[in-house]
C-alpha cells in the first residue's frame, strides 16, 4: 500500500481565467481555472473576506486537483486553491515565476505518484494537511520540504511565515 504522504496529492499550477461571486453564498467565489487540461475546472473558494475580486482575475495559483468533486452551495467544485491560513488571515500561495498552467508541484524527498482521486473515506488529505506549513521564509512546505516546480522554483505566501496551509 502507498505511504500516506504529500506525493498522494495532485498539486498543480493553475491560472484563474475568471472569478465571480457565488450566486447563493456571500463568502464564496466561483472561479474558472486553467490547469493545463482541455477545459478549465470550476473551483469554489471561501476567499471573499480575504482577497478582493479584482485580485482573483488572471491570478496564478496552486490547486489541489484530486479531491473528490463536491457541491458547495449548489456549485460543483473540482479543485481547491491552496492558501496559507491563520485564524486572522489568508494568503493565496504564489507559484514561482515562469510557471504555466498544468505544471506539477513536486517534493524532493517524496517522489511517489498522486492518486487519481483521493478516497474521502480514507481521509488522506486530512492526514497530510497538518504537516503543510509555510516556513520562516514563507516558503510552502510539507514537513519542511518545499513545494517545488522543477526548474522554476518554490511556492510561497506573500507575508505569512510559520503558518498552516489549507
Amino acid at each position: 500500500s502507498k505511504p500516506i504522504d504529500v506525493s498522494r496529492l495532485d498539486l498543480r499550477i493553475g491560472c484563474i481565467i475568471t472569478a465571480r461571486k457565488h450566486p447563493d453564498a456571500d463568502s464564496l467565489y466561483v472561479e474558472e481555472v486553467d490547469v493545463g487540461e482541455i477545459a478549465p475546472r470550476t473551483v469554489v473558494s471561501g476567499l471573499v473576506n480575504h482577497v478582493p475580486l479584482e485580485q482573483m482575475q488572471n491570478r496564478m495559483v496552486i490547486l489541489l486537483c484530486n479531491l473528490k468533486p463536491a457541491k458547495m452551495r449548489g456549485v460543483l467544485s473540482q479543485a481547491m486553491v491552496m492558501c496559507a491560513s491563520s485564524p486572522e488571515k489568508i494568503e493565496i500561495l504564489a507559484p514561482p515565476n515562469g510557471s504555466v498552467p498544468g505544471d506539477r508541484i513536486t517534493f524532493d524527498a517524496f517522489p511517489g505518484e498522486p492518486d487519481k482521486e483521493l478516497n474521502p473515506k480514507k481521509k488522506i488529505w486530512e492526514q497530510i494537511q497538518p504537516d503543510l506549513h509555510t516556513n520562516d521564509e514563507c516558503v510552502a512546505t510539507y514537513k519542511g520540504v518545499p513545494f517545488e516546480v522543477k526548474g522554476k522554483g518554490v511556492c510561497r505566501a506573500q507575508t505569512m511565515s510559520n503558518s498552516g496551509i489549507k
Epitope: 491563520s86 516556513n135 520562516d136 521564509e137 512546505t141 520540504v145 510561497r156 510559520n162 503558518s163 498552516g164
Partner: antibody
Framework: AVHLVESGGGFVQPTESLKISCAAS????????MYWVRQAPGKGLEWVAR??????????YYADSVKGRFTISRDDSKSMVYLQMDNLKTEDTAMYYC?????????WGQGVMVTVSS | DIVMTQGALPNPVPSGESASITCQSS???????????LNWYLQRPGQSPHLLIY???TRASGVSDRLSGSGSGTDFTLKISSVEAEDVGVYYC?????????FGSGTKLEIK
C-alpha cells in the same frame, strides 16, 4: 548530502574585528533563511543573527548582545553566509555555528572557534 | 525577550528507565494558529546540536519514537522512554514565536 562548513575563526584582541564564513551545499541555499548561533565554552546555545532570502529583502535580525557590532550577510551566487564581527569583546568568545532550519530539515555546521582575549 | 527555563535531571539516569526534561517559557508560545512554537534540540558530546522536536510535539525525521514532546502554552516536557547510550548529551528547548530566538540553558542527560 547537505553540508555547512564554517571558516575564518581565530584569536583576536578586544576591539578588533573578524569575519567568519559559512559555505553551504546540498540544498537550495537561495530559498533558505540562514542563522548564526554561538556557544561559549562550557555554556549553552545563544542565537546571534538571522538573514532572510531575496523575496524577503534579505532582512536581518540580531540578538541585543551583538546589535550594532555584528553584521550578517549572504552571497546567493556562492551559497555563502558571513558574519562580520566588529569591536569584539571577551564575552564574544565562543564556537560559532552556521545553521538553517525548515521543520523536519535542520542543518548545522561543525562550528568555528572565535577567541577574544588580550 | 522570552526567557526559557530548563529543569535539571536527577543524574545519572539508569539505562532502560525513562527521563523527563522540563522547560518553561516566560510567555505563552501558543500561536493563534493553534501551533506551539517550541523546538527541542540534542547536542551530543563533541557534536553540533540537532533538532529532535518542533511545534512542541512533532518529531523531526529520523528521531526515535522513544522521544515525545508535550505541554501547554508555557510548560513543556520532553520524555525519553527507555534511555539508551545514544541519548546522552545536553537537551535544549528553544522558542521560535518571536525574535530574539531564545534557548533554555540546557539539561544534561547522563546514563548510569
Amino acid at each position: 548530502a547537505v553540508h555547512l562548513v564554517e571558516s575564518g575563526g581565530g584569536f583576536v584582541q578586544p576591539t578588533e574585528s573578524l569575519k567568519i564564513s559559512c559555505a553551504a551545499s546540498g540544498f537550495t541555499f537561495s530559498d533558505a533563511a540562514m542563522y548564526w548561533v554561538r556557544q561559549a565554552p562550557g555554556k549553552g546555545l545563544e542565537w546571534v543573527a538571522r538573514i532572510r532570502t531575496k523575496p524577503n529583502n534579505y532582512a536581518t535580525y540580531y540578538a541585543d548582545s551583538v546589535k550594532g557590532r555584528f553584521t550578517i550577510s549572504r552571497d546567493d551566487s556562492k551559497s555563502m553566509v558571513y558574519l562580520q564581527m566588529d569591536n569584539l569583546k571577551t564575552e564574544d568568545t565562543a564556537m560559532y555555528y552556521c545553521t538553517s532550519w525548515s521543520y523536519d530539515f535542520d542543518y548545522w555546521g561543525q562550528g568555528v572557534m572565535v577567541t577574544v582575549s588580550s | 525577550d522570552i526567557v526559557m527555563t530548563q529543569g535539571a535531571l536527577p543524574n545519572p539516569v539508569p539505562s532502560g528507565e525513562s527521563a523527563s526534561i522540563t522547560c518553561q517559557s516566560s510567555k505563552s508560545l501558543l500561536h493563534s494558529s493553534g501551533k506551539t512554537y517550541l523546538n527541542w534540540y540534542l547536542q551530543r558530546p563533541g557534536q553540533s546540536p540537532h533538532l529532535l522536536i518542533y511545534w512542541m510535539s512533532t518529531r523531526a525525521s529520523g528521531v526515535s519514537d522513544r522521544l515525545s514532546g508535550s505541554g501547554s502554552g508555557t510548560d513543556f516536557t520532553l520524555k525519553i522512554s527507555s534511555v539508551e547510550a545514544e541519548d546522552v548529551g545536553v537537551y535544549y528547548c528553544q522558542q521560535f514565536l518571536e525574535y530574539p530566538l531564545t534557548f533554555g540553558s540546557g539539561t544534561k542527560l547522563e546514563i548510569k
